[in-house]
């Protein structure tokens, strides 16, 4: 996926160095891995490991590669056509509502509830009431009320930082 594009994401303007490949735009657009020149005549390749573009575009600059935060692991590096993929470390997760940081998974469920879902890089453990089977959406329970569980194993990316 491409990263959302705002002013701070655009790589600083650099004149095309000799090693940067050029090609001609197609219908005014440049292919993934390139951006368009200021005069619109050339497609200039992004710089591997520094910036990227994922779609056909008329961007004046490629997008700056994301760096994974502490508390994240890099699943795949930035290429000219794909941003870095970062994932929360084991035992932590990132919610869609709070994508800024990885949060620690709960260690267990409240009394009277059972765990039906493990901690993953994109979700906390899931607890349901023993009798009704309804999900628990409360805060982290007090320690004496918990049934402990081990963190789940990492799977696919929780957040494509690009």
């Amino acid at each position: 996926e491409s990263a959302l594009i705002t002013q701070q994401d655009l790589a600083p303007q650099q004149r095309a160095a000799p090693q940067q490949k050029r090609s001609s735009p197609s219908e005014g657009l440049c292919p993934p891995g390139h951006h368009i020149s200021e005069d619109g005549r050339d497609c200039i390749s992004c710089k591997y490991g520094q910036d990227y573009s994922t779609h056909w575009n008329d961007l004046l600059f490629c997008l700056r590669c994301t760096r994974c935060d502490s508390g994240e692991v890099e699943l795949s590096p930035c290429t000219t056509t794909r941003n870095t993929v970062c994932q929360c470390e084991e035992g932590t997760f990132r919610e869609e509502d709070s994508p800024e940081m990885c949060r620690k998974c709960r260690t267990g469920c409240p009394r009277g509830m059972v765990k039906v879902g493990d901690c993953t890089p994109w979700s906390d453990i899931e607890c349901v009431h023993k009798e009704s089977g309804t999900k628990h959406s409360g805060e982290v329970p007090a320690v004496e009320e918990t049934v402990t569980s081990s963190p789940g194993t990492p799977a696919s990316p929780c957040s494509l930082s690009g």
Partner: nanobody
């Protein structure tokens, strides 16, 4: 909070053109990314185009490359999608989106923080 309102949809014959507008209110969106998705009947929402701040350029899906042009006027807090050479398969509800953080993927529906109500585009053959 950002409110988005699309307009400009309608019925058009294959080969024709339409221009969609998306007016944002609630706060300045000059440093936000804006984009366009569509949902065809019975299908998932599909990324079409993403417009960067200050007319710095746009991203396009392969399916609309060369036919659709995204633009924006930050002074008016409005984004536009100029659609030409329309095809029957372009029929669907067109949504304007805004995403607020640099880490959010704008080319996936999950990455959009704010959605408009959508405007219907029907392309007849």
């Amino acid at each position: 909070q950002v409110q988005l309102q699309e307009s400009g949809g309608g019925l058009v014959q294959a080969g024709g053109s339409l221009r969609l507008s998306c007016a944002a209110s609630g706060r300045s969106i000059s440093n936000y990314a804006m984009g366009w998705f569509r949902q065809a009947p019975g299908k998932e929402r599909e990324f079409l185009a993403a417009s960067v701040w200050n007319n710095g350029g746009n991203y396009y899906a392969d399916s609309v490359k060369g036919r659709f042009t995204a633009s924006r006027d930050d002074a008016k807090s409005t984004a536009y999608l100029q659609m030409s050479r329309l095809r029957p398969e372009d029929t669907g509800i067109y949504y304007c989106v805004v995403a607020r953080t640099p880490e959010t993927p704008i080319t996936s529906a999950r990455g959009a923080n704010y959605w408009g109500q959508g405007t219907q585009v029907t392309v007849s053959s």
